[in-house]
């Protein structure tokens, strides 16, 4: 039975040209995290495998940095980066947990962080 929950940074906004940290946290489970996938819509951004380490997709190599932790740092943001991001936690023996973050990249300097929320 899957008892865990994923807490994410929720809906966030950032300035064009700036950077943002995408962060998820899996709690309420003793399951072992074997791999975390970061995806933007249906595109793979990065993978962190417990045994094999980090892999950043070639098309994002110059703008995506691993960490902190299992999170992901997006740099040199453009308005095209606006959209949904998913952290997918592969765990043993529970299975897969998915968290969603919505990022809005703003032209102006009025970017604010949204509230945190939980996905069961």
């Amino acid at each position: 039975m899957m008892t865990g929950t994923i807490e994410t940074t929720g809906n966030i906004s950032a300035e064009k040209g700036g950077s943002i940290i995408l962060q998820c946290h899996l709690s309420s489970t003793t399951a072992q995290v074997t791999q975390v996938n970061w995806e933007q819509q249906d595109q793979l951004l990065a993978i962190c495998n417990a045994d094999l380490g980090w892999h950043i997709s070639p098309s994002f190599k110059d703008r995506v940095a691993p960490g902190p932790g299992l999170g992901l740092t997006l740099q040199s943001l453009t308005v095209n980066d606006t959209g949904e991001y998913f952290c997918i936690y592969h765990t043993y023996p529970d299975g897969t947990y998915t968290g969603r973050i919505f990022l809005e990249v703003l032209e102006s300097s009025v970017a604010e962080h949204g509230a945190r929320f939980q996905i069961p």
């Epitope: 074997t34 094999l52 380490g53």
Partner: antibody, heavy 121, light 108 residues
Framework: QVQLVQSGAEVKKPGASVKVSCKAS????????MHWVRQAPGQGLEWMGV????????SYAQKFQGRVTLTRDTSTSTVYMELSSLRSEDTAVYYC??????????????WGQGTMVTVSS | EIVLTQSPGTLSLSPGERATLSCRAS???????LAWYQQKPGQAPRLLIY???SRATGIPDRFSGSGSGTDFTLTISRLEPEDFAVYYC?????????FGGGTKVEIK
């Protein structure tokens, strides 16, 4: 062209160990991950583990953890799979398979010809 | 782990006919992290399709893959004599990477 050539068939007694080799050619050996998959007679395919390009990183299926060891020798472009504490259920054809991508994508693009390992007393 | 169930177990068809093979996952395979392999007796498997629908290098266009989520299909538009073999689906979304039990396509 890309080729993976495996060592010959082995017959082992229960409790023994076996070491199967997989020699790669036709590509940059240090750029790709290598998987190992086995197939028991008349059965389907079972992923065992994967080893990184430098040999520094490995990941094993839970089922084989502690019994399988993957290593690689860059000087000879060879990957090795050692399975210990053999039992009759380990009788199978063992395949090495090169990953399709520059990481452990899990897509097994090129396969060795297979090595039959028979475990019998 | 993700369990893949293939159906039917055996498909009896004649050359020239269309073959439709099914693969169902026990949980959603995001972004179509699914591959298909062909295996002939005494030979190693051969990669046919990855990403659910992308053909591997050198694979003829009579082979096509489709589907997303939990339901995937491999279609062989017109069976050639060399296509009679066992076909396996495989997910590479969630480790450990797993294979289906296979579908045997045999000559009717």
């Amino acid at each position: 062209q890309v080729q993976l050539v495996q060592s010959g068939a082995e017959v082992k007694k229960p409790g023994a160990s076996v070491k199967v080799s997989c020699k790669a050619s036709g590509y940059t050996f240090t750029s790709y991950y290598m998987h190992w998959v086995r197939q028991a007679p008349g059965q389907g395919l079972e992923w065992m583990g994967v080893i990184g390009p430098s040999g520094a990183s490995t990941s094993y299926a839970q089922k084989f953890q502690g019994r399988v060891t993957l290593t690689r020798d860059t000087s000879t472009s060879t990957v090795y799979m050692e399975l210990s504490s053999l039992r009759s259920e380990d009788t199978a054809v063992y395949y090495c398979a090169r990953d399709h991508s520059d990481y452990w994508s899990g897509i097994m693009e090129v396969w060795g010809q297979g090595t039959m390992v028979t475990v019998s007393s | 782990e993700i369990v893949l169930t293939q159906s039917p177990g055996t498909l009896s068809l004649s050359p020239g006919e269309r073959a439709t093979l099914s693969c169902r996952a026990s949980q959603s395979v995001r972004s179509s992290y699914l591959a298909w392999y062909q295996q002939k007796p005494g030979q190693a498997p051969r990669l046919l399709i990855y990403g659910a629908s992308s053909r591997a290098t050198g694979i003829p266009d009579r082979f096509s893959g489709s589907g997303s989520g939990t339901d995937f299909t491999l279609t062989i538009s017109r069976l050639e004599p060399e296509d009679f073999a066992v076909y396996y689906c495989q997910q590479y979304f969630s480790p450990p990477w797993t294979f289906g039990g296979g579908t045997k396509v045999e000559i009717k």
